[in-house]
Amino acid sequence: VPDKTVRWCAVSEHEATKCQSFRDHMKSVIPSDGPSVACVKKASYLDCIRAIAANEADAVTLDAGLVYDAYLAPNNLKPVVAEFYGSKEDPQTFYYAVAVVKKDSGFQMNQLRGKKSCHTGLGRSAGWNIPIGLLYCDLPEPRKPLEKAVANFFSGSCAPCADGTDFPQLCQLCPGCGCSTLNQYFGYSGAFKCLKDGAGDVAFVKHSTIFENLANKADRDQYELLCLDNTRKPVDEYKDCHLAQVPSHTVVARSMGGKEDLIWELLNQAQEHFGKDKSKEFQLFSSPHGKDLLFKDSAHGFLKVPPRMDAKMYLGYEYVTAIRNLREGTCPEAPTDECKPVKWCALSHHERLKCDEWSVNSVGKIECVSAETTEDCIAKIMNGEADAMSLDGGFVYIAGKCGLVPVLAENYNKSDNCEDTPEAGYFAIAVVKKSASDLTWDNLKGKKSCHTAVGRTAGWNIPMGLLYNKINHCRFDEFFSEGCAPGSKKDSSLCKLCMGSGLNLCEPNNKEGYYGYTGAFRCLVEKGDVAFVKHQTVPQNTGGKNPDPWAKNLNEKDYELLCLDGTRKPVEEYANCHLARAPNHAVVTRKDKEACVHKILRQQQHLFGSNVTDCSGNFCLFRSETKDLLFRDDTVCLAKLHDRNTYEKYLGEEYVKAVGNLRKCSTSSLLEACTFRRP
């Protein structure tokens, strides 16, 4: 019989008492085969973290800073359940740390040196740890003691709870630096008042502070937020302009064998019976013998953290950077305007080899990082392990939802001004063998399908979006008799046609021979009835243009396109017979890397782009003999985006809407995780 006990870790006598009450009340409402609670008492949160790692306890609720400690080796814990605040309809699991300034003050984030600062309190998250952590490498050396470095960075501050004797500048704006509400500039409202009164130039608070202190929009409009990219935004645009997004209070468990489903089952049932306004005799979010015992008193309920989300992703790049800077205190030798090497994310073995060759030729400008799937690469870019990669539009959408931005677009047509003219897009098509003359768009049910990969534009999002509109359900594996859609569940009929061996079968990378445009076309040639690819795929792999044994004798005339009106046309008539126009593949990165990725890639394409004529004796960035490694092989150049510099603007309203409609069919664990952080 599986053990269905969750051992909750308590850090005080009062918490242990509430835990026992929690245990007893759960016993009275949960059937005997359901989850149960046991209580383990430890002296501190760090002891609880160690106990969970050592399998002596299973769960504890932590503030963000401790979630970071819990994630670090050797603890390796992960967030599993989040407390939420506000309403069930609009649950808030995060808050945003922001830098507020007066509208007319005219400086940016990178011009804070010499300004006057207002903090909620020394050592507090939004008011100190996050802003000072992010500014850490700009502080004057020596950076220890930290208070002295901060005092020398700003021209005056109010940092309640600081030592006014040793660091008088930190108390210059609030004599005495009192550590309670007796100090008018203490806490969130106090730090904002410090700015409002004109004592300081910038206040480090949370996003709700401004709304709680200024009910009137006209008054709020006198303030702005400083963004990390050295721009400003209105105070209500905090989701796009903050220092960090911080989880409020989170249950953590072991990463392996951590009982996360059991913990969720327990807490979900607990909130049903003992949540807000549920029961008089025991209340989960109330602490008669103290404050915030086991859970925050202000919490309204729990939400399950998506399983794909590790602590780094949950805490976010900015928060992790700030806390790591403060804890480790390491900075580059001397901060320069020089760009660091761009860490390119390569998918599996073959892309890694091409990336390595690029890296050698780039002379220190490009480094390589590997991952097994596109989503793993996106996650690595999010957390700073990698910086950039080029993505199909479907993944540009996921990357955008995860906070990444497009920076350059692949262009596929030769033109005089290639780098300045991003193209409208390419065509997604459905290809069939000419010999299968009875096959049309209207009778694909029961046929064998070939897809570039799940989540990609031409191979999945466009054809499956159109199909969804017709069949109104997501069981595409039942619609087709079998197929190869790399990235599908291994036991799905949409992996049946795939050719990868062993663990590589149906993997969404080049280890699966039917992956990508060329792979999907090969699948059609060898096994399938229809392939969903781009309009250039057939000509690029016929007439001897692909020397591989399976392709070298193929003839373009032996294939036709399915049109949406039920007719068929020759391959060259794609402009009048396609499923939809698809946005070109684009390079994505984090916002903080945007300028450097742009600069370095433009240099790299001038060295190794289409201007290189002999690819047998030189490194060519946009060539890999039909394998589309790192970039599509038909890329002519990487083009500037001009003002299409967000994923929505880049992909266009129509495509974003189409992918949004398919979201209910999404199997993307990363998309689920990212929409948890930003619904």
């Epitope: 050698v360 030729n361 047998s616 490194f619 490694l629």
Partner: nanobody
């Protein structure tokens, strides 16, 4: 297509040195990039060092300052001088000229380097 044959591996004590050679069956003068990779037991292939036709070099962080890559176009040979060897350098070492354009899984026999006391 140029064939490549690696040699020079062997058993060496920690702190010792070895020089690996990679002899090509044809001219390497026009080859853009050559590199040494290694594969430790149970691990994936890892780039150790690379060199361009113009002589620009790159090294993995773990070997910087200890290994030196060079190519002699007149002898059609790529070299890897390995000094201050450590136990973690134990692996099969392969050379490549990237001419198979990444996707054909062709690697030579390699040469085994064992660092042990």
């Amino acid at each position: 297509e140029v064939q490549l044959v690696e040699s020079g591996g062997g058993l060496v004590q920690p702190g010792g040195s070895l020089r690996l050679s990679c002899a090509a069956s044809g001219s390497i003068a026009s080859i853009a990039t050559m590199a040494w990779y290694r594969q430790a037991p149970g691990k994936g292939l890892e780039l150790v060092s690379g060199i361009t036709r113009g002589g620009s070099t790159k090294y993995a962080d773990s070997v910087k300052g200890r290994f030196t890559i060079s190519r002699d176009n007149s002898k059609n040979t790529l070299y890897l001088q390995m000094n201050s060897l450590r136990a973690e350098d134990t692996a099969v070492y392969y050379c490549t000229d990237y001419s198979r354009k990444y996707y054909q899984d062709y690697w030579g026999q390699g040469t085994l380097v064992t660092v042990s006391s």
